[in-house]
């Protein structure tokens, strides 16, 4: 039902849920200490503008007893809960940064008259997309399918000759929710994915994906799979793996394979990392010093969406426009604000836009080096390294059908 | 609007090294790639190589491998090129230039080296 | 490496007539083609990447097209501040830059 908003009057309030089933498990008091960084900052653009306003967030907490997995698997109804708290409390705000597990954000986006806008940390399943008032700040399954079908088809690069159309697709079900999401999308039969791809079959089983490492038999020689590296040894260990075999790693949230002293461990040498590229600066501000490079991205895109509802808040104060009103929580799309780390854009779903960055191991360095950057606001590939020391034979990608590798 | 600024004109001996900078103002820095393209006297333009300063490593022009080191400073949004085992060939005006990967849009004014005896 | 050839070397033109100039890679590059202009004494200038598309602040006489290894940028009607050096360039490989065609005043 309809609930009045604090939302006028010169002051505005931002409505903060912080749940006990969230996508990354980050201690709650990490998220708070983002949020009341990105309320410093916006107070003070909005002072810097002349605006003198006030903006607070309110944290809304569940009831941990009913909701304690920890995990997403029961966030579905914690999210309605939260929302039927607030509205018995009349305490909504102008806007909603919360749910971050894509069961919750789909049930409350379904099951609620949304004349408010949603932002969320996370959210990353192919049911979230297109949603008119809902912003999402770390990449969507969709910007990852995007890429992976543009990866498949280019064949006019130095070190990629061939189209590919074949895919496995190791998912064994103990994923994390953003590798779920991204995963659900590669398997799903009506994905853009599945549509672009003549093979794609999904290994369940440890042993599948163990098997087809060394099986002359194999359909392709491309396995998708998401997770770091330890993930990646605790299956594959030292076992030996077929020359024209490329395993791509996706592990979108972690800074680490930029850092100066990491050397690629010996099982790498047939992966291919899909990551994100890295911030401008490493986050040295009160609520960054207790995080992980993983958990750094769900912290930021907390403090990030304050600041996108401080950029929001600036533009329709600066015409006079009403914040409580339908076009308001429609307008947090198709822009670019100041983001903590430089610019964030945000297509026109209100999805973020980023730097998507494949790494591969370098045979004589044994580092992490850039192969090629794709943009998800253009869906373009840009290489970087044009004579990549790989493993593969002529320092070129094979073919993804056994057979007919590198001519 | 993003300006490159180089360091001034070097004279050098043969077997020295020559480390030439670039700082860049009023624009990003750290996402796009910073290359290094020199010019010999009445010549055509020779790319060195390039770095992107967010990822920290560079690539080479294969002519240039093993003598030439590409570096970047994110904190102060400069760029570097250092040049080693210097000979008179290597007489020439040395730019850099930011660019989105390897098509260059933003020139610095260049950098005068002379190499001699 | 992919060795690029532009012809002429030399083009002699009057103020006010059009100007074309052709850049051949020795493989296809696709569209990653750049062409800029230099004048004595100064840096370089992008005028057109992708084969095609002008840089920002690029006047409208300047067009760029082909794809593959046969490139052509034409100049419609040549101003005075025109007459210069262009360079073609390729970036699907590592860089490599044209020889440069002279475009003085006939």
């Known amino acids: 039902s309809q609930v009045s908003q604090n939302c006028h009057n010169g002051s505005y309030e931002i409505s903060v849920l912080m749940m006990g089933n969230s996508a990354f498990a980050e201690p709650l008091k990490n998220l708070e200490d983002a949020v009341n960084e990105g309320l410093e900052i916006v107070r003070g653009r909005l002072q810097n503008a002349g605006l003198n306003v006030t903006v607070n967030a309110t944290f809304m907490y569940s009831d941990g007893l009913i909701h304690n997995s920890g995990d997403c698997r029961s966030s579905t109804c914690e999210g309605l809960d939260l929302l039927r708290k607030i509205s018995n409390a009349q305490r909504m705000g102008c806007v909603l940064i919360g749910p971050s597990c894509t069961y919750s954000t789909f049930q409350m986006y379904l099951d609620t008259e949304l004349s408010y806008p949603m932002i969320s940390a996370g959210s990353f399943g192919l049911s979230c997309d297109y949603k008119e008032t809902l912003t999402r700040l770390m990449s969507p399954a969709r910007k990852l399918m995007y890429f992976l079908v543009n990866f498949w088809k280019t064949n006019d690069l130095p070190f990629k000759t061939y189209s590919w159309s074949t895919s496995y697709v190791y998912k064994n079900g103990t994923e994390t929710e953003d590798c779920f999401w991204y995963l659900n999308a590669l398997e799903a039969s009506v994905s853009y994915f599945s549509h672009e791809l003549g093979f794609k079959v999904v290994l369940r089983q440890d042993k599948e994906f163990q098997d087809i490492l060394m099986d002359h038999n194999r359909k392709s020689n491309v396995i998708i799979m998401c997770g770091g590296p330890e993930f990646l040894y605790k299956l594959k260990g030292d076992r030996a793996v077929a020359e024209d075999i490329v395993i791509i790693l996706v592990d979108l949230f972690n800074d680490q394979y930029f850092e100066d002293n990491v050397t690629a461990p010996d099982y790498m040498k047939n992966v291919l990392v899909l990551t994100l590229s890295p911030g401008n600066s490493l986050l040295n501000s009160s609520f960054s010093r207790n995080l992980s490079p993983t958990k750094r991205d769900f912290a930021l895109a907390y403090l990030n969406g304050i600041l996108l509802f401080g950029h929001m808040l600036k533009i329709f104060l600066e015409n006079g426009e009403n914040i409580t009103t339908p076009k308001f929580a429609h307008a947090f799309r198709n822009l670019t604000f100041e983001g903590y780390d430089g610019p964030v854009t945000l297509d026109d779903w209100g999805d973020v836009d980023s730097t998507m960055v494949l790494l591969y191991t370098s045979v004589d360095t044994k580092k992490y080096k850039v192969l090629l950057t794709y943009d998800t606001h253009v869906n373009k590939t840009y290489p970087v390294d044009m004579s990549p020391t790989f493993t593969w034979k002529n320092s070129k990608l094979p073919n993804d059908i056994t057979g007919r590798g590198p001519q | 609007e993003v300006q490159l600024v180089q360091s001034g004109a070097e004279v050098k001996k043969p077997g020295s090294s020559v480390k030439v900078s670039c700082k860049a103002s009023?624009?990003?820095?750290?996402?796009?790639?910073i290359s290094w393209v020199r010019q010999a006297p009445g010549q055509g333009l020779e790319w060195m190589g390039g770095?992107?300063?967010?990822?920290?490593?560079?690539n080479y022009a294969q002519k240039f491998q093993g003598r030439v080191t590409i570096t970047a400073d994110k904190s102060t949004s400069t760029a570097y090129m250092e040049l080693s085992s210097l000979r008179s060939e290597d007489t020439a005006v040395y730019y850099c230039?930011?660019?989105?990967?390897?098509?260059?849009?933003?020139w610095g004014q260049g950098t005068t080296v002379t190499v001699s005896s | 490496d992919i060795v690029m050839t532009q012809s002429p070397a030399t083009l002699s033109v009057s103020p006010g007539e059009g100007a074309t100039l052709s850049c051949r890679a020795s493989q296809s590059v696709s569209s990653n083609l750049a062409w800029y202009q230099q004048k004595p004494g100064r840096a370089p200038r992008l005028l057109i990447y992708g084969a095609s598309t002008r840089a920002t602040g690029i006047p409208a006489r300047f067009s760029g097209s082909g794809s593959g290894t046969e490139f052509t940028l034409t100049i419609s009607s040549l101003q005075s501040e025109d007459f210069a050096v262009y360079y073609c360039q390729q970036y699907n490989n590592w860089p490599s830059f044209g020889g440069g065609t002279k475009l003085e005043i006939k």
């Open positions: 230039a930011r660019g989105h990967y390897y098509y260059m849009d933003v």
């Open positions: 770095i992107i300063p967010i990822f920290g490593t560079a």
């Open positions: 009023g624009g990003t820095f750290s996402s796009y790639a």
